[in-house]
């Protein structure tokens, strides 16, 4: 009774998609960290079938199904979904485990069903069955929190709409010097909807439910901080609430703050001021401007002025719909095997994007960082110098964006030779694509330096696997050529590789391989 191969089935969920494994009733959100799908083997007449726990994914969500194999040696695989075969490219991780992945992006009802992965390894043949259920996103929602002013109070109410109903918390940081990282010592959390303390350095409201966590930061201009080198910009969509806070500290109470939009003072009732004394007896004032539902005419430069500080401005732009701006042109890179390299995309977007990097049916977490010029950047460095096509995919509520990258890894040629009754042929991989020379070895040329100018036919490369370019060159033999030693050489910028062939041989009979760097 043959031992069953050790395999692990894993679900990787991508930001805010509400996918989960297990019973349909227990929807969970796994943010980027792999979730074990508990593959259990069922022996069948046609071989072993491993069945993974059912995967639940919200419509428009993105997931990766992954199988990790501890079995050593070569393996080949094939994905089958609704009787269609899909490409499969296994790779090996640092622990030498075989990894097979299938990325399913932007899931729709048509992508629900059974995904079969057929695996052939040296040890055994077997099948892994994944069942993917898609649930209507109408049932599961998590909207980004927004702010409202409390009736008759100078306080902020945090509202988040969602199903199941989200829990709301305020995350406050009052430190200029210390870290405002979520788990840092300067951070205070308040699990309540109303906030009266509005003097902190950083104020954000976060909402959480089964779909994940969304946060909104209170946009702030601090008159005691030097202005940024580029004007801060705030994007909003028509109908969204605008909240913009101006904060200033002075040695005494003898100063005031005002908000202006395009040099016109804001109307009464669209702002409120609060002040307090700090521990060192200096006065902190804040002035909060708000519009409960913005329209196009709320666009413009909002300037906060103080009688004791230089004024500062922010540009508020009101949009009909969200956007993702980035250059979508395909990019191609060629690097040496030892070079360190990252793919990167600079973009401007509103609302914030959800993104993923994809390579060979596998998807990878996407980090993004807002730069000070209003752009954000996402970089992907974990490609392990594997040649191929890489995809950056981003989406928000209103827009989608895809950018393709090609990575080529320079590689020295490696020649394989073959001789038949009528011809000698050599093939080689390597990048850039190798060029060929054929040389004759004779009494006159014992070092095989005499070039063969005629009868050579070079075939254009074809790709076995992405990035593995294969080029071949064939020498047609005349009767006079029989009994000769010939040498074929493939060369590119990384080096040269040669094979010597005895032309009398009917079958494959290369007997010398030269590698010249």
């Amino acid at each position: 009774n043959q031992d069953l191969p050790v395999i692990k089935c894993v679900l990787i969920s991508h930001e805010n998609n509400g996918s989960s494994a297990g019973k349909p009733s227990s929807y969970r959100m796994v943010r980027g960290s792999p979730e074990d799908l508990q593959c259990t083997p069922r022996r069948q007449s046609e071989g072993t079938v491993y069945e993974a726990a059912t995967v639940e994914v919200a419509e428009s969500g993105s997931i990766t199904l992954q199988v990790q194999l501890a079995t050593p040696g070569d393996l080949s695989c094939l994905w089958v979904f609704k009787h269609s075969s899909l490409g499969c490219q296994p790779h090996f991780d640092l622990q030498n485990r075989g990894i097979v992945s299938m990325a399913i992006l932007n899931v729709t009802e048509t992508q629900a069903g059974e995904y079969l992965l057929h695996i052939q390894s040296e040890a055994a043949n077997y099948t892994v069955l994944f069942t993917v259920n898609v649930r209507d996103t109408q049932l599961y929602v998590l909207r980004r929190p927004y702010f409202r002013k409390m009736e008759n109070q100078d306080a902020l109410l945090c509202i988040s709409e969602g199903v199941p109903e989200p829990t709301v918390e305020w995350v406050l940081c009052s430190s200029h010097r210390e870290s405002c990282k979520e788990e840092g010592p300067a951070v205070v959390r308040k699990e309540e909807k109303v906030l009266h303390e509005l003097f902190g350095t950083d104020i954000r409201c976060c909402a959480r439910n089964a779909l994940g966590r969304e946060s909104t930061k209170l946009f702030t201009i601090d008159l005691n901080q030097a202005p940024q080198s580029t004007l801060p910009q705030l994007f909003l969509k028509v109908g969204e609430p605008l909240w913009i806070r101006c904060k200033a500290i002075h040695v005494n109470h003898g100063f005031g703050l005002t908000w202006e939009l395009e040099d016109k003072a804001l109307e009464e009732g669209s702002y409120f001021e609060m002040s307090t004394y700090s521990t060192n007896r200096t006065m902190i004032r804040i002035l909060l401007a708000f519009v409960s539902s913005v329209g196009r005419n709320d666009t413009g430069y909002y300037t906060c002025s103080s009688s004791k500080h230089p004024s500062q401005s922010a540009l508020v732009t009101i949009l009909e719909k969200g956007f993702i701006n980035a250059t979508s042109s395909q990019e191609e890179y060629e690097i040496d095997p030892y070079e360190k390299f990252c793919f990167s995309v600079r973009f401007k977007a509103y609302p914030r994007i959800r993104c993923t990097w994809i390579f060979s049916q596998a998807s990878f977490p996407c980090e993004q960082r807002g730069l000070e010029d209003g752009y954000s950047i996402s970089k992907f460095c974990d490609h392990k110098n594997k040649p191929g096509e890489y995809i950056f995919y981003a989406e928000n509520d209103d827009a989608q964006f895809t950018k393709m990258f090609t990575l080529n890894i320079r590689k020295k040629p490696q020649v394989l030779a073959n001789a038949s009754a009528s011809q000698a042929s050599c093939s080689s991989d390597g990048y850039p694509l190798p060029s060929w020379t054929w040389k004759k070895c004779s009494d006159k040329s014992p070092n095989c330096t005499e070039e063969i100018p005629e009868g050579v036919w070079n075939k254009k490369a074809n790709r076995k696997v992405f990035g593995q370019w294969v080029s071949s060159s064939t020498l047609n033999m005349s009767e006079a050529g029989k009994g000769l030693l010939v040498k074929c050489c493939a060369y590119n910028s990384m080096g040269t590789s040669c094979e010597t062939i005895f032309l009398n041989s009917p079958g494959p009979f290369p007997f010398i391989q030269d590698n010249i760097s």
């Epitope: 202005p227 080198s229 690097i335 070079e339 990252c342 600079r346 960082r369 730069l371 010029d373 970089k379």
Partner: antibody
């Protein structure tokens, strides 16, 4: 072995000119952005200028803009800094440095290979 | 353009942990990828941390970096006499297309 070797430093009078060179070896020079960084005696590091791998993008510190010109010759694996209208405050050790990543957006990565520096003294 | 502020000097006994901070004069340093360099007297700088918290090959695990909110930090655990050097933080200012270095921190191992 990856190496950078600066040359061209020396003593020059205020208002004079000097051209620094940085010879690169052991890597695909055209794949990397390069920078010049200087350090005045007893002071900290100050970035001077940077250039993209193809030579198409150039960047300058405000203190040298209009006086210094960065360039590169990828066929010779060499980086240059042409320094005109030199001032006493330009006196420093000048290092050339390579970006950590090939084909990098400057927003990340830093500089992982540095030369040993060439000393520029501006004095009358 | 913003500046990066570092403490002028820090000192610690061998075997202890030392931290060096780097703060932006305006805006949040969290919008930058931060690099840290070590420079010993008479030598060129050496990159010890890049992209906030990654270490180049050959740099001991004792060197670690973090970046959150208002401050980036270089932490050196189990400090050794050989760690005595000047340390500089560095970021790219994408609004002015400039590299910016901090003023440097002299680490003395007591």
């Amino acid at each position: 072995e990856v190496q950078l070797l600066e040359s061209g430093g020396g003593l020059v009078q205020p208002g004079g000119s000097l051209r620094l060179s940085c010879a690169a070896s052991g890597f695909t020079f055209s794949s990397y952005a390069m920078s010049w960084v200087r350090q005045a005696p007893g002071k900290g590091l100050e970035w001077v200028s940077a250039i993209g791998g193809s030579g198409g993008s150039t960047y300058y510190a405000d203190s040298v803009k209009g006086r210094f010109t960065i360039s590169r010759d990828n066929s010779k694996n060499t980086l240059y800094l042409q320094m005109n209208s030199l001032r006493a405050e330009d006196t420093a050790m000048y290092y050339c440095a390579r970006d950590y990543y090939a084909f990098s957006d400057p927003a990340y990565g830093g500089m992982d290979v540095w030369g040993q520096g060439t000393l520029v003294t501006v004095s009358s | 353009n913003f500046m990066l502020t570092q403490p002028h000097s820090v000192s610690e006994s061998p075997g202890k942990t030392v931290t060096i901070s780097c703060t932006r004069s305006s805006g949040s340093i969290a919008s930058n990828y931060v690099q840290w360099y070590q420079q010993k007297p008479g030598q060129a700088p050496v990159l010890v941390v890049y992209d906030d918290s990654d270490r180049p090959s050959g740099i001991p695990e004792r060197f670690s970096g973090s970046n959150s909110g208002n401050t980036a930090t270089l932490t050196i655990s189990r400090v050794e006499a050989g760690d005595e050097a000047d340390y500089y933080c560095q970021v790219w200012d994408s609004s002015s297309d400039h590299w910016v270095f901090g003023g440097g921190t002299k680490l003395t191992v007591l």
